[in-house]
Interface confidence: low
């Protein structure tokens, strides 16, 4: 606010006042009178730039008059009291109320004193973020969506992620006149590595004290990615039982595991137990290629592993999963 002038009456008011759509707002306006200065205020007037006539007048003897009596009210001015506070309350703010207003004091003997105030009409947006569930497409697709509904002015949306990706933002008029709905899509080539990771949508708006952060957990549907673990190329005759595990990552979860060999069904020494395969002790060398086939709702994938059981005494540390 401007400092009061020295030796002169000065009108004090903020240069800008924010108000919310549908709410009420007070446009503050005061007359600063230096000590020992004799000032008589005969009238308070509010006018809007670009419009002829006054929107609100408070006269020292006639009291208040308004262009829209249901929407305007002098907050502090009273008949019979010194007119020093011209603050005006506006009810039911509309988009078209945004603009420049002049607050004017008619004083004697100093003459008229005025100040301009910019009324800014804001609407606080509602923000939502949601995942766009996708399959492996091989090309960039929207994987998350962030919507800021009914903001005035439009909200700013940005994305934060260590996965890369590209924002694509658009705007459409909001439900209430003068408001804007902003939609931002976060676009990336889907991969299994992205599934379950988070991206954050940041929404900034001048009605927020701080940016709103909305986290989206990404979903990528993909067929199983399969590998077999538990074999160290170091299995010997006479060794205890060993276990192989069919490791599968997929979304949705695997629905079935099927073990076989390149020659057909499993040999007697191999017993399937879901994702695991129990290898029993054998008495002659073996060289077999095992296959684990994993199914989920999107398809089936398999992994192969060639297992050799060799002659020769097992060393102290040979084999894995030994009992």
């Amino acid at each position: 606010w401007p400092p009061p002038g020295t030796g002169d009456v000065v009108v004090q008011a903020p240069t800008q006042v924010p108000g919310f759509l549908g709410d009420s707002v007070t446009l503050p306006c005061y007359l600063q009178v230096p000590n020992m200065e004799v000032t008589h205020v005969s009238q308070l007037t509010w006018a809007r730039h670009g419009e002829s006539g006054s929107m609100a007048v408070f006269h020292q003897t006639q009291g208040p008059s308004y262009s829209e009596s249901k929407r305007l009210e002098f907050v502090a001015a009273r008949l019979g009291a010194e007119l020093r506070n011209a603050s005006l309350r506006m009810f039911g703010l509309r988009v078209e109320d945004e603009g420049n207003y002049t607050c004017l004091f008619v004083t004697f003997p100093q003459g008229s004193r005025s100040v301009d105030i910019w009324l800014r009409v804001l609407a606080k947006p509602q923000n939502t973020a949601e995942v766009q569930k996708v399959q492996l497409t091989g090309e960039p697709v929207p994987m998350a969506r962030c919507v800021s509904t009914g903001g005035r002015p439009p909200a700013q949306i940005t994305w934060h992620s260590d996965l890369g990706g590209m924002p694509n933002t658009s705007q459409v008029p909001g439900f209430l006149s003068g408001t804007v709905t902003v939609t931002s899509l976060w676009i990336l080539v889907p991969s299994s590595q992205v599934d379950g990771k988070n991206v954050t949508c940041k929404v900034e708006h001048e009605s927020f004290e701080k940016p709103q952060l909305l986290t989206v957990n990404l979903t990528v549907y993909y067929p199983p990615e399969v590998s077999i673990s538990g074999y160290d190329n170091n299995w010997y005759l006479g060794q205890n039982e060993a276990t192989l595990t069919c490791d599968a990552r997929s979304n949705p979860e695997p629905t079935g595991y099927n073990w076989s060999t390149t020659m057909g069904p499993l040999p007697p020494f191999a017993v399937a137990q879901g994702a695991q395969l129990l290898i029993r002790p054998v008495d002659k060398p073996i060289n077999t290629t095992l296959i684990c086939n994993v199914t989920n709702a999107l398809g089936a994938r398999q992994a192969e592993l060639t297992v050799q059981v060799k002659e020769g005494p097992p060393s102290e540390h040979s084999g894995i999963s030994r009992n």
Epitope: T169, E204, P211
Partner: antibody
């Protein structure tokens, strides 16, 4: 009042690196992205990239990947941009700014590679 | 990358004139455009954001308009302090890109 204080002018040799700084005052440093912009008479204003100091997440213009590295020190509310393997093409004025909802830019750092 | 083609490069004007600068985006950027003013030897200062919203403290002789691909900055009643270079910038997509600038000079 928002202020962005950038480090002073630099005169450096080709092939070396330089680290420019931008100290933010008057707002919550971790809440707003810090963008870096290059300005030359030939190419005008070019966006280099941005860092979100709160999370450390960065985004770069492909053109400046490998050339610029953005970092931020939350404790001192300072953003940094390191430019590597400098050539005369890197001579420019470099600005930092929280760009979108704020009007404020740093005063700029003039870099001369010669 | 989105190209922002700004015209004209130079513009001669007199105090009190009305001038317009245009920016054309190579693809739809909704209303995600900022206009900057840069005076000689100074940093850029943002005037308008979201294509048509004035920043607080910017005189109302500066007006922004447009959406999609075509944007305009209009200065009505040009003042001597408005002599500067003006840039547009889109923030719909990374990388953010700027127009090449329009220099406003006195006739």
């Amino acid at each position: 009042e928002v202020q962005l204080q950038q480090s002073g002018a630099e005169l450096v040799r080709p092939g070396t690196s330089v680290k420019l700084s931008c100290k933010a005052l008057g707002y919550t440093f971790t809440d707003h992205e810090m963008h870096w912009v290059k300005q030359t008479p030939v190419h005008g204003l070019e966006w280099i990239g941005t860092i979100h100091p709160g999370s450390g997440v960065t985004a770069y213009n492909q053109k400046f990947k490998g050339k610029a590295t953005l970092t931020a020190d939350k404790s001192s509310s300072t953003a940094y941009m390191e430019l590597s393997t400098l050539t005369s093409e890197d001579s420019a004025v470099y600005y930092c700014t929280p760009l979108w909802l704020r009007r404020d830019w740093g005063q700029g750092t003039t870099l001369t590679v010669s | 990358d989105i190209q922002m083609t700004q015209t004209p490069k130079f513009m001669s004007t007199s105090v009190g004139d009305r001038v317009s600068v245009t920016c054309k985006a190579s693809q739809n950027v909704a209303t995600n455009v900022v206009w900057f003013q840069q005076k000689s030897g100074q940093s850029p200062k943002a005037l308008i954001y979201s294509a048509s919203y004035r920043y607080s403290g910017v005189p109302d002789r500066f007006t922004g308009s447009g959406s999609g691909t075509d944007f305009t900055l209009t200065i009505s009643n040009v003042q001597s302090e408005d002599l500067a270079e003006y840039f547009c910038q889109q923030y719909n997509n990374y990388p953010l890109t700027f127009g090449a600038g329009t220099k406003l000079e006195l006739k």
